[in-house]
Amino acid sequence: VSITKCNSDMNGYCLHGQCIYLVDMSQNYCRCEVGYTGVRCEHFYL
């Protein structure tokens, strides 16, 4: 799978994680930090 960094406009899209662009799927994706979940890594779980 080809990935690259998200466009500048997506800075801040992922609240607790890193935004990556999945080129083959034409999708932005939030890779969440440990302890966070949700489309935008907005939910904390224990």
Partner: antibody
Framework: QDQLVQSGAEVKKPGASVKVSCKAS????????IQWVRQAPGQGLEWMGR????????KYREKFEGRVTITADTSTNTAYMELSSLRSEDTAVYYC?????????WGQGTLVTVSS | DIQMTQSPSSLSASVGDRVTITCKAS??????IAWYQQKPGQAPRLLIQ???TLQPGVPSRFSGSGSGTDYTFTISSLQPEDIATYYC????????FGGGTKVEIK
């Protein structure tokens, strides 16, 4: 399936304000950004601004700063674009556009006519 | 704001011709450019995103290329149904549309 349903056509007098709504279904607007784009009759496409409904952060094109207000009500999954001090040049079709995980998905457009 | 200079503003070509439209950005947009087709009375239709990624259902005669500040949109063999106005859109840093190119049949 995912939808963005915009409010109906409006006719306004110069100097008045207009508020266009954009109701999302099939997805949560908190997962997206909502952009607003307009197109005057016979003219090109013009980006106006956008809101991040989760953070409640807005960004506007400089030429609209101070005259446009974009808001979102996450409880009703609806975004709004209000344009004030209307003039005849604001006569246009106004589109809301979803962006975020997937690329842009457009509403059907709302015609706003400014006429005395 | 990033500026997008699209050219030409209009063109006339024959059915079967190769048609090329260019967009130049005022700064590097890292391949984050999309191309839209718009027919009179209709909302814009997304053809290509991320420079060259064709949307599902879009004919393969449409293609895109470029990097940095210079991007190209090509129709390899113009068809009567391709008569429309085409717009580029940079979405690297906020959004800016090009001025549009009206494509007509000779």
């Amino acid at each position: 399936q995912d939808q963005l349903v915009q409010s109906g056509a409006e006719v306004k007098k110069p100097g008045a304000s207009v508020k266009v709504s954009c109701k999302a279904s099939g997805f949560n607007i908190k997962d997206t950004y909502i952009q607003w784009v307009r197109q005057a009759p016979g003219q090109g496409l013009e980006w106006m601004g956008r809101i991040d409904p989760l953070r409640r952060q807005t960004k506007y094109r400089e030429k609209f700063e101070g005259r446009v207000t974009i808001t979102a009500d996450t409880s009703t999954n609806t975004a709004y674009m209000e344009l004030s001090s209307l003039r005849s040049e604001d006569t246009a079709v106004y589109y809301c556009v979803r962006s975020g995980r997937e690329f842009d998905f457009w509403g059907q457009g709302t015609l706003v006519t400014v006429s005395s | 704001d990033i500026q997008m200079t699209q050219s030409p503003s209009s063109l006339s070509a024959s059915v079967g011709d190769r048609v090329t439209i260019t967009c130049k950005a005022s700064q590097d947009i890292h391949k984050y450019i999309a191309w839209y087709q718009q027919k009179p009375g209709q909302a814009p239709r997304l053809l290509i995103q991320y420079t060259s990624t064709l949307q599902p259902g879009v004919p393969s005669r449409f293609s895109g290329s470029g990097s940095g500040t210079d991007y190209t949109f090509t129709i390899s063999s113009l068809q009567p149904e391709d008569i429309a106005t085409y717009y580029c859109l940079q979405y690297d840093n906020l959004r800016t549309f090009g001025g549009g190119t009206k494509v007509e049949i000779k």
